[in-house]
């Protein structure tokens, strides 16, 4: 269930301090979009798959991992242009002859239907309607993900209202 974030409108403090600790909240960083229990960042520039992977790491995140068809649909609904494509964290492992997520797990046959070749140097991207494989050297946009984290915000009590 999605956590509800309420606003406190009652102040019973007699002596207001300059700042007050707000309760723990599930927050996405600025510029990141909340989708269920994840925060997503859609890149504005383009890169090969390896550089996209590295960029997400520098942001203390990973390339997008998609758990099921529902999550795929939710993510695709955020892509507003039919032509634009985004790398995700899935590529072809030549040694294991299978699609492998960057967390080490393998693609289940029911998860995603990938259009394109399953071969060396193939990586996976999503568009508004489909999932494709492409040479990893192709330069396109990418999606980073973070798990929603507890953030303790220091805010002025007036900003609670």
């Amino acid at each position: 269930q999605k956590p509800s974030i309420g606003k406190c409108s009652v102040d019973i403090q007699q002596n207001r301090t300059k700042t007050t600790e707000r309760p723990d909240l599930l927050n996405c960083p600025i510029y990141w979009q909340q989708v269920q229990e994840k925060c997503l960042l859609f890149s504005h520039t383009v890169n090969p798959w390896n550089n996209s992977l590295a960029d997400c790491s520098t942001k203390e995140s990973s390339l997008l991992l998609i758990q099921d068809k529902d999550e795929l649909t939710r993510t695709q609904n955020l892509i507003h242009d039919k032509a634009i494509s985004f790398w995700i964290g899935l590529n072809f492992s030549l040694s294991e002859k299978n699609w492998k997520w960057i967390n080490g797990s393998f693609l289940s046959s029911n998860d995603l239907k990938i259009t394109g070749d399953a071969k060396e140097n193939s990586c996976v991207y999503i568009s508004q309607t489909s999932v494709y494989s492409e040479y990893c050297s192709t330069e396109m946009k990418w999606i980073c993900q973070k798990e929603l984290t507890l953030v303790r915000n220091k805010v002025s009590p007036d900003s609670w209202l």
Partner: antibody
Framework: QVQLVESGGGLVKPGGSLRLSCAAS????????MSWIRQAPGKGLEWVSY????????AYADSVKGRFTISRDNSKNTLYLQMNSLRAEDTAVYYC???????????????WGRGTLVTVSS | DIQLTQSPSSVSASVGDRVTITCRAS??????LAWYQQKPGKAPKLLIY???GLQSGVPSRFSGSGSGTDFTLTISSLQPEDFATYYC??????????FGGGTKVEIK
């Protein structure tokens, strides 16, 4: 203003060389796949070559492979086409074209220059 | 290489007419197809991408459909400025990117 402006065309003898340039302005040049597309007088369109945003990936039509070289200078927002060993059948208007951003190598050409005419004749 | 065959090669029509141009690919290309308009002495202009996506700024009277090998460009109500030559282009991820031979839309 978002635009592409080609230059460098002209009359050249068979076996000769020319270097075409395409100056881009009004957009982030380094984010886009760029191509050269040509059109012989009174004929249809023929894709010639593309180069990826970083310049790391390049492809050519079989008809020009080994004779033409595409390159780019992202610091100067300029695309180039070095044409060697020119033939009469290379006579055409050469267009510089930008692909829609982030479609990978599925190229759709959304911005074109006005073209520059290359005439190969003795 | 993938060949694209356009038909008809030319069509005579009047303002207000509905015009349909077809493009057939020699092998399946999913939805990787674009349509362009070109007027004499001018560069081509992108109308439709990914078979049915309307390019920004293009009037809604232009529409595209199809997938696999058969594609259609429809102009629902022909306007004076629509008299031009139209080209389809396939954009499968492996070059070369081929164009159809063109369809000239002329005034009847």
């Amino acid at each position: 203003q978002v635009q592409l402006v080609e230059s460098g065309g002209g009359l050249v003898k068979p076996g000769g060389s020319l270097r075409l340039s395409c100056a881009a302005s009004g957009f982030t040049f380094s984010d886009y796949y760029m191509s050269w597309i040509r059109q012989a007088p009174g004929k249809g369109l023929e894709w010639v070559s593309y180069i990826s945003p970083s310049g790391a990936t390049i492809a050519y039509a079989d008809s020009v492979k080994g004779r033409f070289t595409i390159s780019r200078d992202n610091s100067k927002n300029t695309l180039y086409l070095q044409m060697n060993s020119l033939r009469a059948e290379d006579t055409a208007v050469y267009y510089c074209a930008r692909s829609l951003m982030a479609t990978g190598t599925h190229l759709y050409f959304d911005l074109w220059g006005r073209g520059t005419l290359v005439t190969v004749s003795s | 290489d993938i060949q694209l065959t356009q038909s008809p090669s030319s069509v005579s029509a009047s303002v207000g007419d509905r015009v349909t141009i077809t493009c057939r690919a020699s092998q399946g290309i999913s939805s990787w197809l674009a349509w362009y308009q070109q007027k004499p002495g001018k560069a081509p202009k992108l109308l439709i991408y990914a078979a049915s996506g309307l390019q920004s700024g293009v009037p809604s009277r232009f529409s595209g459909s199809g997938s696999g090998t058969d594609f259609t460009l429809t102009i629902s109500s022909l306007q004076p400025e629509d008299f031009a030559t139209y080209y389809c282009q396939q954009s499968t991820s492996f070059p070369p990117y081929t164009f159809g031979g063109g369809t000239k839309v002329e005034i009847k």
